[in-house]
Interface confidence: low
Protein backbone atom coordinates (compact mmCIF):
# COMPACT_ATOMS: atom_id res chain seq x y z
CA UNK A 1 0.00 0.00 0.00
CA UNK A 2 1.24 3.49 -0.71
CA UNK A 3 2.30 5.50 2.32
CA UNK A 4 -0.32 7.95 3.50
CA UNK A 5 0.41 11.63 3.01
CA UNK A 6 0.40 13.38 6.38
CA UNK A 7 -1.31 16.75 6.55
CA UNK A 8 -0.03 19.38 8.97
CA UNK A 9 -0.08 19.38 11.87
CA UNK A 10 1.17 15.86 12.44
CA UNK A 11 3.47 14.11 14.86
CA UNK A 12 6.73 13.08 13.23
CA UNK A 13 8.02 9.55 13.46
CA UNK A 14 10.33 9.03 16.46
CA UNK A 15 13.74 10.35 15.43
CA UNK A 16 12.21 11.69 12.22
CA UNK A 17 12.22 15.23 10.91
CA UNK A 18 9.59 17.50 9.42
CA UNK A 19 9.34 17.97 5.68
CA UNK A 20 10.44 20.90 3.56
CA UNK A 21 8.58 24.11 4.42
CA UNK A 22 7.55 22.68 7.77
CA UNK A 23 8.97 23.19 11.24
CA UNK A 24 8.75 21.31 14.50
CA UNK A 25 6.74 23.24 17.06
CA UNK A 26 8.14 22.47 20.52
CA UNK A 27 4.94 23.47 22.31
CA UNK A 28 2.55 21.45 20.15
CA UNK A 29 5.20 18.77 19.52
CA UNK A 30 3.95 18.60 15.96
CA UNK A 31 5.23 19.26 12.45
CA UNK A 32 3.53 22.46 11.32
CA UNK A 33 3.53 24.57 8.15
CA UNK A 34 5.96 27.44 7.72
CA UNK A 35 4.70 30.72 6.29
CA UNK A 36 5.81 31.72 2.78
CA UNK A 37 7.99 34.75 2.01
CA UNK A 38 6.01 37.94 2.49
CA UNK A 39 4.07 36.47 5.41
CA UNK A 40 4.62 35.66 9.09
CA UNK A 41 3.02 33.43 11.70
CA UNK A 42 -0.03 35.20 13.10
CA UNK A 43 -1.15 32.19 15.17
CA UNK A 44 1.14 29.29 15.99
CA UNK A 45 -0.07 25.76 15.44
CA UNK A 46 -1.61 23.49 18.06
CA UNK A 47 -2.08 19.74 18.10
CA UNK A 48 -5.27 20.22 16.11
CA UNK A 49 -4.80 23.38 14.02
CA UNK A 50 -2.05 24.45 11.63
CA UNK A 51 -0.08 27.68 11.59
CA UNK A 52 -2.12 30.74 10.61
CA UNK A 53 -0.10 33.07 8.39
CA UNK A 54 -0.68 36.74 7.66
CA UNK A 55 0.85 39.22 5.21
CA UNK A 56 3.69 41.45 6.32
CA UNK A 57 2.71 45.01 7.12
CA UNK A 58 4.03 47.99 5.14
CA UNK A 59 7.81 48.54 5.46
CA UNK A 60 8.34 45.00 6.76
CA UNK A 61 9.33 41.80 4.99
CA UNK A 62 10.24 38.14 5.21
CA UNK A 63 12.50 36.74 2.53
CA UNK A 64 12.34 33.05 3.47
CA UNK A 65 9.80 30.45 4.52
CA UNK A 66 9.46 31.15 8.23
CA UNK A 67 7.48 30.97 11.43
CA UNK A 68 8.46 34.34 12.91
CA UNK A 69 5.76 36.16 14.89
CA UNK A 70 6.60 39.51 13.25
CA UNK A 71 8.10 40.42 9.90
CA UNK A 72 11.49 42.12 9.78
CA UNK A 73 11.66 45.90 9.40
CA UNK A 74 13.05 47.19 6.13
CA UNK A 75 16.21 49.26 6.42
CA UNK A 76 16.02 53.05 6.64
CA UNK A 77 15.66 55.12 3.49
CA UNK A 78 18.75 55.45 1.35
CA UNK A 79 20.91 58.48 2.15
CA UNK A 80 21.63 61.28 -0.32
CA UNK A 81 24.87 59.63 -1.50
CA UNK A 82 23.06 56.38 -2.28
CA UNK A 83 20.52 55.05 -4.74
CA UNK A 84 17.85 52.47 -3.98
CA UNK A 85 18.65 49.47 -6.15
CA UNK A 86 16.03 47.22 -4.56
CA UNK A 87 12.82 48.56 -3.08
CA UNK A 88 11.37 47.41 0.22
CA UNK A 89 8.62 44.90 -0.52
CA UNK A 90 6.85 42.27 1.57
CA UNK A 91 9.40 39.73 0.36
CA UNK A 92 12.67 41.66 0.30
CA UNK A 93 14.56 44.34 2.18
CA UNK A 94 15.53 47.67 0.65
CA UNK A 95 19.05 47.69 -0.78
CA UNK A 96 21.01 50.94 -1.03
CA UNK A 97 24.12 51.19 -3.17
CA UNK A 98 26.45 54.11 -3.75
CA UNK A 99 25.59 56.55 -6.49
CA UNK A 100 27.96 57.06 -9.46
CA UNK A 101 31.16 58.82 -8.44
CA UNK A 102 31.12 57.14 -5.03
CA UNK A 103 32.23 53.76 -3.68
CA UNK A 104 31.26 51.71 -0.66
CA UNK A 105 33.69 52.39 2.20
CA UNK A 106 31.76 50.23 4.68
CA UNK A 107 29.68 47.35 3.40
CA UNK A 108 26.86 45.61 5.20
CA UNK A 109 25.22 42.25 4.57
CA UNK A 110 23.27 43.65 1.64
CA UNK A 111 24.09 46.96 0.03
CA UNK A 112 26.25 49.67 1.56
CA UNK A 113 26.42 51.25 5.01
CA UNK A 114 28.75 54.13 4.18
CA UNK A 115 29.55 55.62 0.78
CA UNK A 116 32.57 57.82 0.15
CA UNK A 117 33.42 59.96 -2.87
CA UNK A 118 35.78 58.45 -5.38
CA UNK A 119 39.32 59.81 -5.10
CA UNK A 120 40.52 62.09 -7.88
CA UNK A 121 44.14 62.01 -9.01
CA UNK A 122 45.62 65.49 -9.17
CA UNK A 123 47.74 66.75 -12.09
CA UNK A 124 51.00 64.81 -12.26
CA UNK A 125 49.24 61.67 -11.10
CA UNK A 126 47.18 59.16 -13.09
CA UNK A 127 44.84 56.35 -12.22
CA UNK A 128 46.79 53.17 -11.46
CA UNK A 129 43.72 51.17 -10.49
CA UNK A 130 40.16 52.29 -11.16
CA UNK A 131 37.57 52.38 -8.42
CA UNK A 132 35.05 49.60 -8.01
CA UNK A 133 31.82 49.29 -6.06
CA UNK A 134 33.83 48.61 -2.90
CA UNK A 135 37.31 50.03 -3.50
CA UNK A 136 38.70 53.49 -4.09
CA UNK A 137 40.79 54.69 -7.02
CA UNK A 138 44.54 54.24 -6.63
CA UNK A 139 46.70 57.01 -8.09
CA UNK A 140 50.33 56.84 -9.17
CA UNK A 141 52.84 59.52 -10.18
CA UNK A 142 53.22 59.88 -13.93
CA UNK A 143 56.44 58.24 -15.10
CA UNK A 144 59.03 60.21 -17.11
CA UNK A 145 57.71 60.78 -20.62
CA UNK A 146 54.08 60.78 -19.47
CA UNK A 147 51.76 63.36 -17.93
CA UNK A 148 48.31 64.09 -16.61
CA UNK A 149 47.05 67.66 -16.48
CA UNK A 150 43.63 66.84 -15.08
CA UNK A 151 42.09 66.26 -11.67
CA UNK A 152 40.22 63.08 -12.43
CA UNK A 153 39.12 59.74 -11.06
CA UNK A 154 39.40 58.12 -14.50
CA UNK A 155 42.31 59.66 -16.45
CA UNK A 156 45.57 57.73 -16.71
CA UNK A 157 49.02 59.17 -17.43
CA UNK A 158 49.39 59.87 -21.17
CA UNK A 159 52.61 60.02 -23.17
CA UNK A 160 54.07 63.39 -24.07
CA UNK A 161 53.67 64.34 -27.69
CA UNK A 162 56.81 63.88 -29.74
CA UNK A 163 57.97 67.15 -31.23
CA UNK A 164 60.14 67.95 -34.22
CA UNK A 165 61.22 71.00 -32.24
CA UNK A 166 60.39 71.28 -28.54
CA UNK A 167 59.25 74.72 -27.44
CA UNK A 168 58.53 73.70 -23.85
CA UNK A 169 59.56 70.30 -22.46
CA UNK A 170 56.81 68.25 -20.90
CA UNK A 171 56.70 67.24 -17.26
CA UNK A 172 54.48 65.03 -15.13
CA UNK A 173 51.62 67.52 -15.17
CA UNK A 174 52.05 69.17 -18.57
CA UNK A 175 52.39 67.97 -22.14
CA UNK A 176 55.34 69.04 -24.23
CA UNK A 177 54.74 72.12 -26.39
CA UNK A 178 55.89 71.78 -29.97
CA UNK A 179 56.72 74.42 -32.55
CA UNK A 180 55.85 72.16 -35.46
CA UNK A 181 52.32 72.39 -36.77
CA UNK A 182 51.59 68.67 -36.92
CA UNK A 183 53.03 66.93 -33.88
CA UNK A 184 52.71 63.19 -33.56
CA UNK A 185 52.22 61.18 -30.45
CA UNK A 186 53.81 57.96 -29.41
CA UNK A 187 50.30 56.70 -28.62
CA UNK A 188 46.76 57.64 -29.60
CA UNK A 189 46.00 61.30 -28.97
CA UNK A 190 43.42 62.67 -26.59
CA UNK A 191 42.71 61.89 -22.97
CA UNK A 192 42.49 58.21 -22.11
CA UNK A 193 39.57 57.34 -19.83
CA UNK A 194 39.18 54.23 -17.75
CA UNK A 195 35.62 52.94 -17.54
CA UNK A 196 33.62 54.53 -14.74
CA UNK A 197 32.83 51.98 -12.02
CA UNK A 198 29.16 51.25 -11.34
CA UNK A 199 29.35 52.94 -7.99
CA UNK A 200 32.36 54.85 -6.98
CA UNK A 201 35.65 59.26 -4.16
CA UNK A 202 38.11 62.11 -4.22
CA UNK A 203 43.33 61.56 -4.43
CA UNK A 204 46.12 63.88 -4.45
CA UNK A 205 44.09 67.05 -4.69
CA UNK A 206 43.55 68.74 -1.38
CA UNK A 207 41.12 66.25 0.05
CA UNK A 208 37.39 66.37 -0.10
CA UNK A 209 36.84 64.14 2.94
CA UNK A 210 33.14 64.82 2.74
CA UNK A 211 30.79 65.42 -0.18
CA UNK A 212 28.68 68.51 -0.84
CA UNK A 213 28.07 68.97 2.86
CA UNK A 214 31.80 69.40 3.48
CA UNK A 215 33.22 72.73 4.63
CA UNK A 216 34.65 75.09 2.06
CA UNK A 217 38.16 74.59 3.31
CA UNK A 218 39.32 71.03 2.97
CA UNK A 219 41.64 69.55 5.56
CA UNK A 220 45.03 68.45 4.28
CA UNK A 221 46.53 65.43 5.98
CA UNK A 222 50.30 65.02 5.97
CA UNK A 223 51.99 63.35 3.04
CA UNK A 224 53.36 60.04 4.17
CA UNK A 225 53.48 56.36 3.44
CA UNK A 226 50.11 54.70 3.30
CA UNK A 227 49.23 52.57 6.33
CA UNK A 228 49.08 48.98 5.14
CA UNK A 229 45.63 47.79 4.24
CA UNK A 230 44.21 44.88 2.32
CA UNK A 231 43.86 45.57 -1.36
CA UNK A 232 45.54 48.94 -1.09
CA UNK A 233 48.68 49.96 -2.88
CA UNK A 234 50.70 53.07 -2.34
CA UNK A 235 51.28 55.67 -5.03
Amino acid sequence: LPAQVAFTPYAPEPGGTCRLREYYDQTAQMCCSKCPPGQHAKVFCTKTSDTVCDSCEDSTYTQLWNWVPECLSCGSRCSSDQVETQACTREQNRICTCRPGWYCALTKQEGCRLCAPLRKCRPGFGVARPGTETSDVVCKPCAPGTFSNTTSSTDICRPHQICNVVAVPGNASMDAVCTSTSPTRSMAPGPVHLPQPVSTRSQHTQPTPAPSTAPGTSFLLPVGPSPPAEGSTGD
Partner: nanobody, 117 residues
Framework: DVQLVESGGGLVQPGGSLRLSCGGS????????MSWVRQAPGKGLEWVSG????????DYADSVKGRFTISRDDAKNTVYLQMNSLKSEDTALYYC??????????WGQGTQVTVSS
Protein backbone atom coordinates in the same frame (compact mmCIF):
# COMPACT_ATOMS: atom_id res chain seq x y z
CA ASP B 1 45.78 45.72 9.28
CA VAL B 2 44.80 49.32 9.92
CA GLN B 3 42.12 49.51 12.62
CA LEU B 4 40.23 52.51 13.97
CA VAL B 5 37.83 52.03 16.87
CA GLU B 6 35.54 54.82 18.05
CA SER B 7 33.85 55.06 21.46
CA GLY B 8 32.15 57.60 23.69
CA GLY B 9 28.90 58.08 21.81
CA GLY B 10 25.54 58.04 23.51
CA LEU B 11 22.32 59.90 24.28
CA VAL B 12 22.68 63.44 25.58
CA GLN B 13 20.32 66.37 26.10
CA PRO B 14 20.63 69.56 24.01
CA GLY B 15 23.32 71.77 25.51
CA GLY B 16 25.14 68.77 26.95
CA SER B 17 28.64 67.46 26.25
CA LEU B 18 30.26 64.25 25.05
CA ARG B 19 33.85 63.22 24.40
CA LEU B 20 34.48 60.80 21.56
CA SER B 21 37.66 58.73 21.39
CA CYS B 22 39.23 56.92 18.46
CA GLY B 23 42.01 54.40 18.97
CA GLY B 24 44.25 53.51 16.04
CA SER B 25 46.39 50.45 15.43
CA UNK B 26 48.21 48.77 12.55
CA UNK B 27 49.99 51.94 11.41
CA UNK B 28 52.33 54.61 12.77
CA UNK B 29 49.65 56.69 14.43
CA UNK B 30 51.87 59.72 15.12
CA UNK B 31 52.66 60.09 11.41
CA UNK B 32 49.09 60.61 10.30
CA UNK B 33 46.59 63.41 10.42
CA MET B 34 43.21 62.34 11.74
CA SER B 35 39.68 63.45 10.90
CA TRP B 36 36.20 63.09 12.31
CA VAL B 37 33.37 62.68 9.80
CA ARG B 38 29.70 62.27 10.61
CA GLN B 39 26.59 61.01 8.87
CA ALA B 40 23.20 62.22 10.08
CA PRO B 41 20.18 59.94 9.50
CA GLY B 42 19.23 59.97 5.85
CA LYS B 43 22.00 62.41 4.93
CA GLY B 44 25.43 62.26 3.31
CA LEU B 45 28.84 62.44 4.94
CA GLU B 46 29.89 65.67 6.62
CA TRP B 47 33.49 66.33 7.52
CA VAL B 48 33.58 67.65 11.09
CA SER B 49 37.17 68.24 12.17
CA GLY B 50 40.78 67.33 11.50
CA UNK B 51 44.15 67.49 13.21
CA UNK B 52 47.66 67.31 11.73
CA UNK B 53 50.04 64.50 12.56
CA UNK B 54 51.98 66.69 15.01
CA UNK B 55 48.86 68.41 16.37
CA UNK B 56 50.07 71.78 15.11
CA UNK B 57 47.00 72.48 12.98
CA UNK B 58 43.36 71.80 13.74
CA ASP B 59 40.39 72.65 11.56
CA TYR B 60 36.63 72.54 11.97
CA ALA B 61 33.48 72.64 9.89
CA ASP B 62 31.64 75.94 10.30
CA SER B 63 28.71 74.09 11.88
CA VAL B 64 30.81 72.97 14.89
CA LYS B 65 33.36 75.80 15.26
CA GLY B 66 33.57 77.07 18.82
CA ARG B 67 31.72 74.04 20.18
CA PHE B 68 33.90 71.07 19.22
CA THR B 69 37.60 70.57 19.99
CA ILE B 70 39.82 67.92 18.40
CA SER B 71 42.96 66.72 20.13
CA ARG B 72 45.30 63.74 20.06
CA ASP B 73 47.45 61.69 22.40
CA ASP B 74 50.08 59.87 20.36
CA ALA B 75 51.29 57.97 23.44
CA LYS B 76 47.86 56.34 23.54
CA ASN B 77 47.37 56.22 19.74
CA THR B 78 44.12 58.07 20.29
CA VAL B 79 42.36 61.10 18.84
CA TYR B 80 39.55 62.82 20.72
CA LEU B 81 36.58 64.99 19.83
CA GLN B 82 35.25 67.06 22.72
CA MET B 83 31.71 68.11 21.85
CA ASN B 84 30.10 70.88 23.90
CA SER B 85 26.80 72.77 23.55
CA LEU B 86 25.38 69.88 21.58
CA LYS B 87 22.36 70.52 19.34
CA SER B 88 19.79 68.14 17.90
CA GLU B 89 21.38 68.63 14.46
CA ASP B 90 24.59 67.06 15.84
CA THR B 91 22.75 63.72 16.01
CA ALA B 92 24.71 61.41 13.71
CA LEU B 93 26.97 58.43 13.41
CA TYR B 94 30.50 59.76 14.03
CA TYR B 95 33.40 58.16 12.20
CA CYS B 96 37.09 58.53 12.80
CA UNK B 97 39.13 58.42 9.58
CA UNK B 98 42.69 58.75 8.33
CA UNK B 99 44.80 58.15 5.25
CA UNK B 100 47.69 59.38 3.21
CA UNK B 101 48.14 62.58 1.22
CA UNK B 102 44.93 64.12 2.50
CA UNK B 103 42.71 61.21 1.56
CA UNK B 104 40.47 59.45 4.06
CA UNK B 105 41.14 55.81 3.17
CA UNK B 106 40.67 54.16 6.54
CA TRP B 107 37.50 54.40 8.59
CA GLY B 108 36.26 53.09 11.90
CA GLN B 109 32.85 51.50 12.34
CA GLY B 110 31.38 54.65 13.89
CA THR B 111 29.85 55.64 17.24
CA GLN B 112 26.29 56.94 17.51
CA VAL B 113 25.61 60.35 19.05
CA THR B 114 21.97 61.22 19.75
CA VAL B 115 21.03 64.68 21.02
CA SER B 116 17.46 64.67 22.27
CA SER B 117 15.43 65.95 25.17
Amino acid sequence: DVQLVESGGGLVQPGGSLRLSCGGSGFTFSSYGMSWVRQAPGKGLEWVSGIYDDGSVTDYADSVKGRFTISRDDAKNTVYLQMNSLKSEDTALYYCATGEDGELNYWGQGTQVTVSS
